[in-house]
């Protein structure tokens, strides 16, 4: 988790002088509770936005937006703590809006936004906005949280972001898998424009089960430049294992930008349909 590399993060708006500060996620008001605290944020919204760094790289960011409730507690609102928690790693990053002037009621509802938390493809986050100061230990909570799922690199806009392109999102192998005679699969895919090797993983499963019954890896050496964007054809031999009929073919490239952690593409061959054979009717009825 990190912030987009903007030199000056701004939270000021007409009628409010405000500055964005790094935060330890442990606001001082936790340690020194105040008697009067503001109410919680209203209408917290998280959306996927995209932003360029100063170097021109494009990153997905969490666009966080919320409004204030129209009550007198805004007189005691000193700022907000924005927290983003990555759920699979428990990593947390916070920033603090520090209000340098008192809020006053005006004809429009106060609205705040922040779009500088860089998020990763295919990750889920919990976004929390805490109004400051935080409540006393038994006080009503004055925060709002929402979960936010970032699409993976298959998503059209995500595909062209720097992290997705670095992991090979622009490569479309267009995998085809064909069942041949004599327990063979013919796998065909389009090579990328890089002299790097690939590995094909064949995993076979019984019908309707997810425990594999056979697994085989096939290595494809780095193509020559004249083979870039050409189709590569590989014939894999299946093993005649009873019921081991569903096959997943997964292709992993080793591009220089993502090394051994590039996006993988897969295709599946289902078990052949079994014809419904009716129960044979006996031509006599046993008497016992």
């Amino acid at each position: 988790l990190r912030l987009l590399d903007h030199r000056a993060l701004v939270c000021s708006q007409p009628g409010l002088n405000c500055t964005v500060k790094n935060s330890t996620c442990l606001d001082d008001s936790w340690i020194h509770p105040r008697n009067l605290t503001p109410s919680s944020p209203k209408d917290l919204q998280i959306q996927l936005h995209f932003a360029h760094t100063q170097q021109g790289d494009l990153f997905p960011v969490a666009h966080i937006e919320w409004t204030l409730q129209t009550d007198a507690s805004i007189l005691y609102l000193e700022g907000a703590e924005l927290s983003v928690l990555q759920l699979n790693t428990n990593e947390r990053l916070c920033v603090r809006f520090e209000f340098l002037s008192k809020l006053r009621h005006h004809h429009r509802r106060w609205r705040f936004t922040f779009s500088h938390f860089v998020v990763d493809p295919d990750q889920e986050y919990e976004v929390t906005v805490h109004h400051l100061p935080k409540p006393i230990p038994d006080g009503d909570p004055n925060h709002q949280s929402k979960n936010f799922l970032v699409p993976d690199c298959e998503h059209a806009r995500m595909k062209v972001t720097t992290p997705c392109m670095s992991s090979g999102s622009l490569w479309d192998p267009n995998i085809t898998v064909e069942t041949l005679e004599a327990h063979q699969l013919r796998v065909s895919f389009t090579l990328w424009n890089e002299s790097t090797h690939y590995q094909i993983l064949l995993t076979s499963f019984p019908h309707m089960e997810n425990h594999s019954c056979f697994e085989h890896m096939h290595h494809i050496p780095a193509p020559r430049p004249e083979e870039f964007h050409q189709r590569s054809n590989v014939t894999l031999t299946l093993r005649n294992l009873k019921g081991c009929c569903r096959h997943q073919v997964q292709i992993q490239p080793f591009f220089s930008s993502c090394l051994n952690d590039c996006l993988r593409h897969s295709a599946t061959v289902s078990c052949p349909e079994m014809p419904d054979t009716p129960e044979p009717i006996p031509d006599y009825m046993p008497l016992w």
Epitope: H211, S212, C213, F214, E215, H216, M217, Q250, Q252, N260
Partner: nanobody, 113 residues
Framework: EVQLVESGGGLVQAGGSLRLSCAAS????????MAWYRQAPEKQRDFVAT???????TYATAVEGRFTISRDNAKNTVYLQMDSLKPEDTAVYYC???????WGQGTQVTVSS
Amino acid sequence: EVQLVESGGGLVQAGGSLRLSCAASGSSFRFRAMAWYRQAPEKQRDFVATINSLGETTYATAVEGRFTISRDNAKNTVYLQMDSLKPEDTAVYYCNEPRGNYWGQGTQVTVSS
């Protein structure tokens, strides 16, 4: 989550032998293909050998006839027996479980001439 731990690397003279081990945690090891890769300084990671779930093996051309990959499913371990070692075999050797794309931390093999 599968964890792979390699061991057995070291310094050996040209023509000598080493046996690398890769211990895997987690169940269903016997149904997994496994592989060895190696990475020399300033080079990309290269395929060395693979063994499928039935114990059938494939080797990179550079090591064919000198290296042998094997597995012991009872011990959840895959081995790489390296004979007739050459200075160009010097690299960090990595164990790989392709399905989950798990990698070990690597073990250094140095072959002196």
